[in-house]
């Protein structure tokens, strides 16, 4: 069948990193530079991505494989085959059309990209409060307040790590 | 082809202006949010403005708003960054970026850039 087919089809014989070239007599001839054919038997071959500004090249561009790009320092990347870079904001902040802005008061983000999101509501498990929430870490839950009376095996809170959840701004 | 120029860098004064442009070409510049983004030398890449689609909205990173505003002429494919009172922490190469399809609705990223132009603010 291969055969079948290259005697029906010269360009099924070009490897890839090259095409088959209508303006030679179907001669297979190497991809431009810049250019890339990832498969046999291509007509013409593709634009090599270009990866500048916001993006950085994490592999070049060969004459078999496009260029695969990872975003500059400040920024992450988004969508498949990081098609998108957007920007890093600091823990305790989240990205907005204005930029990064700091967490609300009750919310945390313990990141550098995603939303702010609220401190867990200890109460709702019938849990206390052991370590307040800042707008970089959510709240510690401890024992329930039952669990602290008299008589039961005291816990002893450990000092907190930050400074209490701050006010608004 | 999706392309970005960008132009009008150059070596000022601190206190002095600057304008920036950004040529567009190969898609619908009318349909996109669009940024400048700069980076000095040996830090991280920082966004500085965007402007929506239409211009109706604006925003700039604190450390330079009031002294830059971004703009847009959709009729000739361009953007634009004005520059006054520039410092020396200014200096740096500014990219225009063109948000992503959906950009401002369920994310910030930016899928195409130019090359750069270099500004420097020195005395």
């Known amino acids: 069948f291969e055969r079948t087919r290259s005697l029906q089809d010269p360009c099924s014989n070009c490897p890839a990193g090259t095409f088959c070239d209508n303006n030679r007599n179907q001669i297979c001839s190497p991809c431009p530079p810049n250019s890339f054919s990832s498969a046999g038997g291509q007509r013409t071959c593709d634009i090599c991505r270009q990866c500048k500004g916001v993006f950085r090249t994490r592999k070049e561009c060969s004459s078999t494989s496009n260029a695969e790009c990872d975003c500059t320092p400040g920024f992450h990347c988004l969508g498949a085959g990081c098609s998108m870079c957007e920007q890093d904001c600091k823990q305790g902040q989240e990205l907005t059309k204005k930029g990064c802005k700091d967490c609300c008061f009750g919310t945390f983000n313990d990141q550098k990209r995603g939303i702010c999101r609220p401190w867990t509501n200890c109460s709702l498990d019938g849990k206390s409060v052991l370590v307040n929430g800042t707008k970089e870490r959510d709240v510690v839950c401890g024992p329930s307040p039952a669990d602290l009376s008299p008589g039961a095996s005291s816990v002893t809170p450990p000092a907190p790590a930050r400074e209490p959840g701050h006010s608004p701004q | 082809q999706v392309q970005l120029v960008e132009s009008g860098g150059g070596l000022v004064q601190p206190g002095g202006s600057l304008r920036l442009s950004c040529t567009a070409s190969?898609?619908?510049?009318?349909d996109y949010w669009m940024n400048w983004v700069r980076q000095a030398p040996g830090k991280g890449l920082e966004w500085?403005?965007?402007?929506?689609?239409?211009?109706?909205?604006?925003y700039y990173v604190d450390s330079v708003e009031g002294r830059f505003t971004i703009s847009r002429d959709n009729a000739r494919n361009s953007l634009y960054l004005q520059m006054t009172s520039l410092r020396e922490e200014d200096t740096a190469m500014y990219y225009c970026?063109?948000?992503?399809?959906?950009?401002?609705?369920?994310?910030?990223?930016?899928?195409?850039s130019g090359q750069g132009t270099t500004v420097t603010v020195s005395s």
């Open positions: 970026a063109r948000g992503g399809e959906g950009y401002g609705d369920n994310h910030y990223g930016m899928d195409v």
């Open positions: 500085v403005a965007n402007i929506k689609e239409d211009g109706s909205e604006k």
């Open positions: 190969g898609f619908t510049f009318s």
